[in-house]
């Protein structure tokens, strides 16, 4: 059974993940991003279901494509450092989903833009955090 300290740790990790995802979204989803139009042409796989921490497997599998798209945004105005950011996210995701059980991710039929993809995982984090608090 989860202890209060493990719940608190999970909550903090989710908040960190949420902040990272929001910062990425904030960095790209605005009119000042010169590469936004191009970035929106890339397609991401969305989870069929995302209600538990194990479903973060679906996010983990899309981190490499995410990094590649974020590399497009590099300019004097964008300080995302995709490699560092994705590496941080990867570490958090691995800790949160655990490595004991192997979960096969199921994807929805429809693909999504980077903005829809990030918003979906932001909503996931907010939803899990709200159940923990």
């Amino acid at each position: 059974a989860p202890t209060s300290s493990s719940t608190k740790k999970t909550q903090l990790q989710l908040e960190h993940l949420l902040l990272d995802l929001q910062m990425i979204l904030n960095g790209i989803n605005n009119y000042k991003n010169p590469k936004l139009t191009r970035m929106l042409t890339f397609k991401f796989y969305m989870p069929k279901k995302a209600t538990e921490l194990k479903h973060l497997q679906c996010l983990e599998e899309e981190l490499k494509p995410l990094e590649e798209v974020l590399n497009l945004a590099q300019s004097k105005n964008f300080h995302l450092r995709p490699r560092d950011l994705i590496s941080n996210i990867n570490v958090i995701v691995l800790e949160l989903k655990g490595s004991e059980t192997t979960f096969m991710c199921e994807y929805a039929d429809e693909t999504a833009t980077i903005v829809e993809f990030l918003n979906r995982w932001i909503t996931f984090c907010q939803s899990i955090i709200s159940t923990l608090t």
Epitope: Q22, M23, N26, P34
Partner: antibody
Amino acid sequence: QVQLVESGGGVVQPGRSLRLSCAASGFTFSSYAMHWVRQAPGKGLEWVAVIWYDGINKYYADSVKGRFTISRDNSKNTLYLQMNSLRAEDTAVYYCARGSYYDSSGYYFGEDFDYWGQGTLVTVSS
Amino acid sequence: DIVMTQTPLSSPVTLGQPASISCRSSHNLLHSDGNTYLSWLQQRPGQPPRLLIYEISNRFSGVPDRFSGSGAGTDFTLKISRVEAEDVGVYYCMQVTQFPTFGGGTKVEIK
């Protein structure tokens, strides 16, 4: 001093078109992004569209996408909003507002929405 | 879209007394460039909006120092230290971290 003057508003029937203009003076128009914002009678503010300093990138609110077109003529220091397929819910005062400043290498800085025009009223009614 | 929620809807204040308006964002507004693009606008009756505060707490040129902004992340506040007659109007928070969105507005009126 910075001045933005909108024109082109009026009464128009649903389904018809209208073109708004915003004449800018007192600053280097070609170095700034520009926005259109609207305000329905007695309501709050709603962002409509933005255009980059060079006119290359344009973005729209979902409510006007596919119907409205933002453009600019830097030689005339003028911003435009072409409004097609107008609906009753487009009735509002339309404001132009100045966006971020871009330097010669495309680096942006400065405040968005720092100067606004007086607005022009568009009424869509049969 | 980022949703901006303002409270209160209306704020009746006595001349010379302080006033405070809150604004909450549905998303953290910290941009990857390190700035938080949260602004406050004032709209006097029959007038266009006017920029008061940008990037949470920076007063725009010509704005009296009785206006101040504070906050971080998702929660922001505009304070008027001593309300004057010319401060009557509607105040809007807005974010330009992503595509611009505005709060619903707070009407400041004299009691």
